[in-house]
Every structure is written in C-alpha cells, then in structure tokens.
Interface confidence: low
C-alpha cells in the first residue's frame, strides 16, 4: 500500500456572466469594487467546480481580472489529479464537465445560477502551468485591462519608474481580431515584449516575443487569433522615453480563400499573402489557394523570400507554418536564402495550396509570388537546383546549388565548349574575331541572338548574345543596343591601406568612397550611380553604426587627414542592407547607401561599371583593390589611398583554404604566398577588374579574410555578379530592406574583418 501520486494540473480561462455589467472600477485591482466582486466571483467559481466530480481534486483558484461582455471573469485554478487520470482531464474534458453542470438542474440554488447567470457557451478553459501563474502574478502590480472598440487605436504606455513589468489584458469585439503594432523609436534598448493569444501570459499561447530593438523590422504588427490578447512589457534599462510605440486595434477577419486561373506565360503573375501582410500571421490562419494552370505543359513555381519549405519527419508540428500542396505536407521555416517550391502539374484540375498556423507561435507574414515554368525545360540554359528550386548557372566553376550538382558532369567548366570536338577554350576568346575551335564554332552566331545560358548576356528585350562581357565595350551587340546603355562608368581620371600596396594618384580610382562617422574613416565603398554608393553590410553591424543619419560619405578623396578641392561629401538618406546578409557566415555582405543629393561627375568623381549577372571574371585575372585600411595586420590605417593588384582565385581552391565556408556570393583574390591583401578599414571597398575596352568593372567588395596578407589565406570579397539583381532592384526602387536593416548579429570568432 502506498499513497496515491497526484499531479498539480493548472488551467486558465474565462466565463461570461449575463446578468452583470463591467464597470471601469473593475479594471482597477486596487478598487473596492474589484475586491468585492472578486470575493463573490471566487466563491461562485469554487461552488461550480465543487458541484462536479472535479471537486475532489480542487486545490486553489483565483479570479484575477474582469472584462466586458457584459461581464467576463478571468480565472486560473489548480486541480490535484491522480497521475493515472492526468491525460483524461484535458481542458476540453474539464470544460465539458463544467458546462454539463451549468446546463443541469441539479443545484438550483447555487450562486452560479442565482447571483451570477453564467453562460455555458461562453466558458473558455485553457491548459496552463505553474510558471504561467508565477508570471501572471509578477505582472499584477502593473495590470492594465483595455477594451479595444472598433475603429479605435489604443496606445499602450510602457512601464513607469516604479514597475519593471506590465501586463496588458486586451479585449475587443468577439467578431474581430486584435492587431498590435510595435514601432521602434530608438536604436538601443533592452526591453522585452511578449504577446500571447490568451487573456494571460500562457507560455503555450505565446505568439511572439521581442528582445532589444530590431533594425530589421522598424515596424512590426502582430495578429491574435481572435478578440483576446495579453501583452507583457518588461523594461530593460530605465529611460524617460519608451524605446517603442505600442498600439492595438480591432480589425476584421480577412478571408484568404482564393481561386485563380493563371495565364500561359512564364513571368511572375501575382502573389499570395497571409491576411494583413506584412503583419505577423495570426495563430488561427488558414489559407486555401486554388490555382488553375492552363496546360499540363506547365508546372507551378512558388517564389519565397527568406522563407523555405521542407518535409517534417515524424509528423511533428510545423512551428513556422504548415503547407499542404497537392496533399503533400511541408513545413515552412525562415531562412536567409531565396527559395522556390516547384509543383509539377500532373492533373488538369489545378493545384490547391493550404497554409495553416499549427501553433500559437507565429512569425512575419508570408508572401509568395507565383509563376509558371515549362515542365520540359524549367531552367532554359541553366541548371535546376533541386534543393531550393532555383535556376542557377551551370558549369561556371561556382557551386551555386548546395549539393554541388550544377558543377557535376561538366565537359568544360567556366570555359566555352567547342561544338566540333568538345574541346574547351577560355571565354574571352569567344567572338573575338579569331577562330579557336576546329571549325570556328566559337566565332559563329556572334551577331545574332542565341539561346540564353550561363555566360550569355541578356539584352533588355530578353534576347541573349553569345559574346561574353559585351557591356560597354563600344560595340552594340544587342539588337536593341542595350549592352551599350548606362555606360558613363568605369573610366579613370586623366592621371595615370592595402597590404603590400602603393599610393594612388588623384582621379585614378574616381569611384572610391570613404564612409565616415564623426570624421573617422570606418569603411570603403564605391560609387555606382549618381545617388548610390555600394559597400559591405558588415560595416553596419554594430548597433551604434546602424542609423543612416550617422554616416558621411566622401568621394574624390585622396588623403584622410586633409581636405582638398576635388573631394565632395554627402549625408546618407537611406541605408539598404541585403535582406539575406548573415553576419556569422559573411554571406550576402553588401549594402547600398542612398546619398542625400545627386553627385556631379568630374575627373575625380565618377562611377565604376556594374557587371551583368552573366559577367565572367576569369580566375587568374589580375584586378585591383583600393582603400585606406591598415598596411599590415593590426596596424594603423593609411592616410593616403592605397592600391594593390590581386589575382582572382578559383572558387574550389579558395574553399579548400577556408574549409568550405566560401559561399557562391563570395569571390577570392590574392596570392598563395599572401603579402598583397585588403585589411581592416578596407571593408566595403571595391575590387575592380579592367576589361579590354579600358573600362573598370566592379567584381567584388572587401568582405573578410583570416588576418591580412597571410600565406594560403586569400582575401574574400562579396561577388557582385551574384547580388547585382538585388542592386538593380534597389536602384530602381523595387526592394531591399530600407531605412535600417540588419539582424542582431554575433561576432564570428575566427575571422578578422577587413
């Protein structure tokens, strides 16, 4: 014989009272009305539990708040349940027992019938934990109940000096859902905000929590699943100013059931969005999109941004959204990479896509573009990477696909393949009016359109030309002449630190920029258009450097410690960090600065040429880096602009040196013996290569490396051709994450930033 083991099961919930009304006195815990009503409601609730078989397990309970509707009582209670019954008393079962009692006629004189007319329909029971009750009790010193009327925007004030933590209990009309907006007003803060899909801070009903001040989402909107929400705000550092503005409103439920018929074309045809995008999707989100495809020749491609889908093994819940596509279950997850889900169309009745939030924890709204692709040739001239659904260049010497299959089975890697005998010739020898292949196939079709491929240049009219790197070479290769447009770039001025470098002369590198904070040079950059400077994203990783207002950009500068007539300065109006930039891996290390006014070009200030996506910078080619960085590892910066020539290194060779940390968005340059390299202070500066036309093209941006000039460790640069689509998008006003822009980062221990 031994004592029965019991387990304390905690429940939280609410009940609706039809014969009483909420008053503002009941919102103030210190009022007499609150205390009186709590005592009576507490007794009533105890009676209700006691009159069911739950009574024998009753431990304790508390009515902790009231709300409108006519009167809603919010409570928690604890039952001590025998362990063997633990699973049988779920919140659903407990609710059934209590509702059963409310509907029965067994105890007509009970106070839940006489004094309180409790509505059985309005009873809510949720699973909770002891910890939830502890958190709830810790916030009751600053407990604020608010009813959010339709059309009202309710501003929530932060905790005051006396309290470090406050809880808002928010309620709106039952047919609407609550939406909280959080807008950051400061760069640095240590506050914590947690939002719950329940009347109290129940861990299992957490929607999202935010710590510190995010630069990635200057405004964040969060939806509840319905009309009840709890927000806990914990102060970090005391300040007289709230680091963010917090407001809430009631909004209508938005339907996301869509039927679409696609047209027989291959460009993006529209997008699917979760309700109130870009708001966080609600815990109750269920979207169903049905797309009809015009023919079985097409497949459907879904293009995601910083979000991807994967199979979830063992049927675990999806924590960032569940997708059902053609009865296939996939889980969404946030990622700093592009992704496309390709859906083969195998039946004429179209495709159904369902998106569901499976747990209360949600995330940023999801937007997915849709387009068709040709099932027989999904990636004309390119390779379909099955891992992420993207079309990537094949056989160009860079493993774009995570499994490397785009570089497998290549007859000629990063070279031209002669049709006659499959011999390989270097790309600059193609269309150079000099036959190199046996029957001269390298010089055929040089004046006409060809199928698009890895090394073909795409003209504005979307036709492709065979000649490699035809941009701005003084010869119109495209029918529409678009290869010779926007060519006011890449020319040096009339005149003829960096480790192992030499001093530059005025006007030699007229695109070079110096990015400064309070008169101190921090990073290099390059002018690419009359209002745009490109640099490295990691220059802005520190919170203290994240605001565009802090920066001054100098162009035409030669010496750091003196001004001269040829230099001009600009403030930064907007800062765009690449949305996929990841500090730990240095991937997508690129940022764009919009200058506060246009640049007037001169002999000492003019832009470098941006390469096309297909531009080929040949490994072995000698290019140049420039900057005011240190001239030796750990040394001071250089006062005069330095230049040094470096050799472009094959990707696989560099990847071996860096143990496969070099991504396709990176390019390596330097020498096996070291000595010539970029260093601290050169970050974001240009790596430029000269084309036969005499024009300089931007191949890379100084990003990272192990030390400076060390043997066997090359300099690593952002590969501009792999981010040029994003650059063009931002320049034409179509995207990027503007006005701010990085994630919270951690420093990578093994690398010194240049």
């Amino acid at each position: 014989y031994k004592a029965e083991v019991t387990i304390s099961q905690v429940y939280s919930g609410s009940l609706r009272v039809l014969n009483r009304h909420f008053s503002q006195d009941l919102a103030r815990r210190e009022s007499i009305a609150f205390r009186t009503e709590t005592a009576k409601a507490q007794k009533m609730f105890q009676e209700l539990v006691a009159s069911t078989r739950l009574g024998t397990y009753y431990n304790s309970s508390s009515i902790y708040a009231f709300g409108e509707g006519p009167l809603i009582c919010f409570f928690w209670f604890i039952l001590d349940i025998p362990e063997y019954q633990r699973l049988t008393l779920s919140p659903e079962v407990v609710r059934e027992l209590l509702v059963g009692e409310l509907l029965s006629n067994s105890s007509a004189l009970a106070s839940y019938r006489t004094e309180y007319e409790v509505d059985p329909e309005g009873l809510v029971i949720l699973e909770a934990s002891v910890n939830d009750i502890v958190v709830l009790n810790s916030t009751l010193g600053c407990y604020r109940y608010s009813y959010v009327n339709p059309g009202q925007v309710l501003r929530l004030r932060g905790p005051d000096q006396q309290t470090t933590s406050c809880l808002w209990h928010l309620q709106g009309p039952e047919d609407l859902m609550l939406k909280v907006q959080l807008e950051w007003t400061r760069v640095d803060c240590r506050d914590r905000v947690a939002m719950y899909d329940a009347a109290g801070p129940l861990e299992k009903r957490l929607i999202t929590s935010v710590y510190g001040c995010s630069r990635q989402e200057p405004v964040m909107e969060v939806l509840a699943s319905g009309s009840v929400m709890a927000v806990v705000w914990k102060k970090g550092l005391h300040s007289f100013y709230d680091p963010f503005l917090l407001s809430v409103k009631s909004v209508a439920f938005q339907d996301c059931q869509v039927n679409l018929t696609l047209e027989g074309r291959l460009d993006p045809q529209g997008f699917l969005r979760t309700p109130y995008y870009p708001s966080y999707y609600s815990p109750s989100t269920h979207c169903s999109w049905h797309l009809t495809v015009p023919s079985l020749d097409y497949g459907l491609a879904l293009w995601f941004d910083a979000y991807a889908l994967r199979r979830q093994k063992y049927n675990l819940l999806c924590t960032q959204g569940q997708w059902m596509i053609q009865n296939r279950r996939l889980c969404g997850f946030r990622t700093l990479q592009p992704y496309a889900e390709r859906i083969p169309v195998v039946a004429s009745d179209g495709i159904t896509i369902n998106f569901t939030s499976q747990i209360s924890l949600t995330g940023p709204g999801v937007q997915v573009y849709y387009s068709l692709y040709n099932q027989s040739d999904p990636c004309p001239g390119e390779f379909l990477c099955s891992v992420n659904g993207l079309c990537v260049p094949a056989c160009d010497g860079i493993k774009d696909c995570p499994n490397g299959l785009d570089e497998r089975n290549c007859v000629c890697r990063a070279m031209f393949q002669c049709q006659e005998d499959s011999t390989c010739i270097s790309l600059p020898r193609v269309c150079d009016r000099q036959p190199d292949c046996l029957n001269g196939s390298d010089e055929e079709q040089c004046q006409e359109g060809v199928p698009c491929g890895t090394f073909t240049f795409q003209c504005e009219d979307r036709s492709c030309v065979k000649k490699p790197n035809p941009e701005c070479d003084g010869q119109a290769d495209c029918r529409d002449g678009s290869d010779e447009e926007h060519c006011d770039c890449g020319l040096q001025g009339p005149s003829s630190r960096i480790v192992g470098g030499a001093m530059s002369s005025e006007g030699e590198w007229p695109w070079q920029a110096s990015l400064q904070i309070r008169g101190r040079h921090i990073c290099g950059g390059a002018l690419i258009a009359d209002r745009w400077v490109i640099t490295a994203a990691h220059c802005f990783q520190e919170d203290s450097m994240a605001s565009p207002r802090l920066w001054t950009v100098f162009l035409g500068k030669m010496r750091q410690n003196s001004r001269w007539p040829g230099e001009v300065s600009f403030k930064v109006s907007r800062l765009f960090l690449h949305p996929y930039h990841e500090e730990d891996s240095h991937d997508y290390d690129v940022a764009l600065l919009q200058l506060d006014h246009p640049v007037v070009y001169s002999a000492t200030v003019r832009p470098v040429c941006l390469p096309a996506r297909s531009h080929f910078f040949e490994p072995g080619q000698h290019c140049w880096i420039t900057g005011w960085g240190a001239q030796r590892e750990g040394g001071p910066g250089s006062s005069t602009l330095q230049k040094v020539d470096v050799q472009l290194i094959p990707q696989d060779l560099c990847n071996e040196a860096y143990r496969y940390q070099v991504t396709p968005r990176m390019l390596c340059a330097g020498y096996r013996k070291g000595k010539k390299d970029a260093c601290q202070g050169d970050s974001g500066g240009p790596l430029v290569c000269k084309e036969p036309s005499g024009r300089w093209f931007l191949a890379g941006l100084v990003s990272w490396g192990l030390g400076c000039g060390r043997p066997n460790f090359f300099g690593v640069y952002t590969r501009v051709t792999r981010v040029v689509n994003w650059i063009q998008q931002v320049l034409t006003g179509g995207g990027g994450s503007g006005g701010g822009g990085s994630h919270h980062h951690h420093h990578h221990g093994s690398h010194h930033h240049h």
Epitope: K313, N315, R328, E341, R342, I343, V346, L384, G389
Partner: antibody, heavy 124, light 111 residues
C-alpha cells in the same frame, strides 16, 4: 554502391504466410518511397505495393489488398512484405524497388533501382 | 485496376526506328504525366528508360524517347541496335496510391 537485396522467399503451401525482406544500402533509405513488384513465371511485371518514406501513405494492388502488408524500418534500412493467405497465383519472383530521387520530394512513381528478386512458390 | 495494353511484340532491323504503344484510360495514362518505360533483358531486373512521359535518366541513350497523346503513351527506339532486344514494360500512376504496369512488349531486332 546503391543496392537492394531481397530475401525470405521459398516454397509455401496455399493459405500459409511468408515475410519478405529487402535490405537497402548505399543511399539514404528514409528519403525514398519503396515498392514491391512481382513477375509470375513467363509473365509480365505486376505492381504489388508501395510505401512512403515515413509509412504514412501506403498503396496495394487490388489482387493483394487485405492479404499483404508492406512496412519499413528506417533505422535498419529494411523494407518488408508480410504475405498472408497465400494463393497459387501469388507464385512469382518478387522484386524490391526504389522510387527515383524526387527533385522536390515528389513521387514520380518510377523505380530507378531494383533488387535481383526473391522467388516465392505457392503450391501444395 | 486493369493492366495497360501493350502489343505483345514489335520488331525492326538494326538502324531502323520502332514505336511501342501503351494504352490506358483517362484515369491513369490520360490523367497523369507519370508514365514510365522499363527495359528487361532475360533473367535480369528491369531498368528504367523513360519517366514522366518523356524524361530520360542519365546513362540512357538518346535513341530512346517517350511521348503521350490522350490515353496512349509511346516509346520510340530509333537507330535500333542488337542490345535493344528485350522486353519493354510501360507503367503509369493510376491514382489512390496505385501503380499499374502494361502487359509487356517483346522487341526483336531482326537480322
């Protein structure tokens, strides 16, 4: 090397049971749909059954439904076919086959790797 | 589910082309693009030659091609060679997690 090796075949009387196994090696077993296909003496190929990577989707040919059970043990990289209430017409060479790598984890219903088969004879 | 219909035999001389048909219904071949073709030499396991109507796995010569029209799929072997002599089976997904094979066609290379 990608390999499938069937075992468990033999002579069995009508109405009795037999369990076939297929040991997989050289590939990630739990990434693939697996199938059983049989071929009667002098006859054509006949699809018997298929099972998804996580066993949540299973299909059977009408001729074996209710009598045969397909299962898999991803930890051991083994596919099974439990055959009950065997009939003379179940006599065949039983092949285990692997679904082609689906680029997006889609089923293409195409078998790109086959074993050498195990013979089942049902006779009194 | 009933088997797909294939001609029992087909033949051609070396260098010629031969086409084998595979007829199903609007619920299998006609509805889905999941038609495959397998080659089987005597006492050997089958080998996939075509999948998804017309796709060729790597290593399969481009002399083998597949197509589909309505409820009928076809396998064409051009530039016939002696080693092409074998049994050929078509298969299709038939819905409800079922696959169906054809009865098989014996391809003979004459001469």
């Amino acid at each position: 090397e990608v390999q499938l090796v069937e075992s468990g075949g033999g002579l069995v009387q009508p109405g009795r049971s037999l369990r076939l196994s297929c040991a997989a090696s050289g590939f990630t077993f739990d990434d693939h749909v697996m199938y059983w296909v049989r071929q009667g003496p002098g006859k054509g190929l006949e699809w018997v059954s298929g099972i998804s990577w996580n066993s949540d989707t299973i299909g059977y040919a009408d001729a074996v439904k209710g009598r045969f059970t397909i299962s898999r043990d991803n930890a051991k990289n083994v596919l099974y076919l439990q055959m009950n209430s065997l009939r003379p017409e179940d006599t065949a060479l039983y092949y285990c086959a692997r679904e082609k790598d689906g680029d997006f984890y889609y089923n293409y219903f195409v078998m790109d790797v086959w074993g050498q088969g195990t013979t089942v004879t049902v006779s009194s | 589910q009933s088997a797909l219909t294939q001609p029992p035999s087909a033949s051609g001389s070396p260098g010629q082309s031969v086409t084998i048909s595979c007829t199903g219904t609007s619920s299998d071949v006609g509805f889905y693009n999941f038609v495959s073709w397998y080659q089987q030499h005597p006492d050997k396991a089958p080998k996939v030659m075509i999948y998804e109507v017309s796709k060729r796995p790597s290593g399969v010569p481009d002399r083998f091609s597949g197509s589909k029209s309505g409820n009928t799929a076809s396998l064409t072997v051009s530039g016939l060679q002696a080693e092409d002599e074998a049994d050929y089976y078509c298969s299709s997904y038939a819905g409800s997690n079922k696959v169906v094979f054809g009865g098989g066609t014996k391809l003979t290379v004459l001469g």
